[in-house]
């Protein structure tokens, strides 16, 4: 007989076909994989299943974010008897199947990593044909993307009473420490805002009052490197404007 397990959110977890002694459904994924932005990562995933010598059609799927409902980033299908899993979906063309699903391996290569790829990924296999069955990893593998700092924005903005303030926003993982230097400043950590919700890798530092003309430099640093950018403040004395 066939038993279908359902979790509390009514998502199909897996279907177990009970027959003569056989392996149960299971998936082996590491809790976390780390890689640098711009490089490639491998998300390992192997599985066991109770259907001995299954040779029918199969589909391999990887999702991001959450199991069962998260968006698919990769999907391939292998016809009956075929060792080749033909890619049907590869988000931005950066996901490539390394493993052979016929040999219980769904491992995936992710190319040209970006900080936005830092999330959890879930592998899933579906059997169709004589046997209808599927299984998906519940906990998934966390892809931790590290990156040297990059200053994404630096600007001078007007403040009340004809004053000016400077803002510097940088990204990186680990989140970079920001420091301002400039006329009569020495080295100042300034007012560093915590990473914003949904922008976990962005850090902003503000210089609330620019008191002198000249060059102001923002430096972002973490364990992987450092980056700096500058802005120039030149006020037209006797006028209310500034050139930056």
């Amino acid at each position: 007989f066939v038993r279908t397990k359902i979790d509390t959110t009514e998502n199909l977890l897996n279907t177990e076909v009970h027959s003569s002694p056989a392996q149960r459904w299971s998936m082996q994924v590491p809790p976390e994989v780390s890689a640098e932005a711009g490089d490639a990562a491998v998300l390992p995933c192997t599985f066991t299943h109770p259907h001995r010598h299954y040779d029918g059609p199969l589909t391999a799927i990887w999702r991001a974010g959450e199991p069962y409902a998260g968006p698919q980033v990769f999907r391939c299908a292998a016809a009956r008897g075929s060792e080749l899993c033909q890619t049907a979906l590869s988000l931005h063309g950066r996901f490539r199947l390394l493993g052979n699903p016929r040999r219980n391996d769904l491992s995936l290569r992710v190319e040209r990593l970006a900080l936005a790829d830092d999330r959890r990924y879930f592998c899933r296999v579906e059997f169709a044909g004589d046997v209808h069955d599927r299984y998906e990893s519940r906990h998934g593998v966390r892809l931790h993307v590290t990156a040297a700092p990059r200053i994404v924005n630096i600007s001078v903005l007007p403040s009340p009473a004809h004053a000016f303030r400077a803002l510097c926003t940088a990204e990186g993982e680990p989140p970079p420490a920001l420091a301002w230097s400039g006329p009569a400043l020495g080295n100042s950590l300034a007012a560093v805002r915590s990473p914003r919700e949904g922008h976990g890798h962005l850090v902003t530092a503000e210089l609330p009052a620019l008191t002198h003309d000249g060059r102001y430099t923002c430096t972002a640093a973490n364990s992987l490197g450092r980056s700096e950018a500058s802005v120039y403040l030149f006020r037209f004395h006797g006028a209310s404007g500034a050139s930056t």
Epitope: P30, V33, A35, D39, A40, A41, V42, L43, P44, L84, Q86, T87, A88, L89, S90, G93, R96, L97, L98, G99, S107, R109
Partner: antibody, heavy 121, light 111 residues
Framework: EVQLVESGGGLVQPGGSLRLSCAAS????????MNWVRQAPGKGLEWVAQ??????????FYAASVKGRFTISRDNAKNSLYLQMNSLRAEDTAVYYC????????????WGQGTLVTVSS | EILMTQSPATLSLSPGERATLSCRAS??????????IHWYQQKPGQAPRLLIY???NLASGIPARFSGSGSGTDFTLTISSLEPEDFALYFC????????TFAQGTKVEIK
């Protein structure tokens, strides 16, 4: 049986152009990435260019030594791979092989017999 | 660019002997246990033929006397007992990072 047959090689003067072709048969051409790999006389192998398939937006990749001079393309309807070679130099003299790779691995599981390109005045 | 180096340049052995060929990468070519190293055989006047992919997987139709091992930067191709048809040139290649690069090759010749 997988077959890759190159053509279009020959003698060309420095600065000249040549277009190589590779006719593929015995497999579903659309499912694979295709490559050109070259071998200078008596030397080792050098990967030249790769073109991916439709799912991978026909993305192209080149070795630094040929970037801007060579263009890889494919015609899925004709099961054919091409290499347009411009501004040829003496150091481009080699046997050019057409090679297939799976979408998951940048290794070359089938190769053609090659076509010789000689750049000389 | 990852630089690939093979040693020795030439290996002189007799049929029936064991051949051990080395391949070294200038930086690690292994990610999460997957090693992006592949081995090819080439005979004079012929195209290369894939022997081993991803360090240790035997390509289709290749005899079991060929095996591959290694991780990180150091890899080995072993031919357990040389057959007359095994005397040829052998290349390793990395696909860890583009551009994909080959080593200069090892020639296995009859002693």
């Amino acid at each position: 049986e997988v077959q890759l047959v190159e053509s279009g090689g020959g003698l060309v003067q420095p600065g000249g152009s040549l277009r190589l072709s590779c006719a593929a048969s015995g497999f579903n051409f659309n499912d694979y990435f295709m490559n050109w790999v070259r071998q200078a006389p008596g030397k080792g192998l050098e990967w030249v260019a790769q073109i991916r398939n439709k799912i991978y937006t026909y993305a192209t990749f080149y070795a630094a030594s040929v970037k801007g001079r060579f263009t890889i393309s494919r015609d899925n309807a004709k099961n054919s791979l091409y290499l347009q070679m411009n501004s040829l130099r003496a150091e481009d003299t080699a046997v050019y092989y057409c090679a297939r790779s799976l979408t998951g691995g940048d290794y070359f599981d089938y190769w053609g017999q090659g076509t010789l390109v000689t750049v000389s005045s | 660019e990852i630089l690939m180096t093979q040693s020795p340049a030439t290996l002189s052995l007799s049929p029936g002997e064991r051949a051990t060929l080395s391949c070294r990468a200038s930086q690690s070519v292994t990610i999460s246990g997957y090693s992006f190293i592949h081995w090819y055989q080439q005979k004079p006047g012929q195209a290369p033929r894939l022997l081993i992919y991803r360090a240790s997987n035997l390509a289709s139709g290749i005899p079991a006397r060929f095996s591959g091992s290694g991780s990180g930067t150091d890899f080995t191709l072993t031919i357990s007992s040389l057959e007359p048809e095994d005397f040829a040139l052998y290349f390793c290649q990395q696909s860890r990072k583009s551009p994909w690069t080959f080593a200069q090759g090892t020639k296995v010749e009859i002693k």
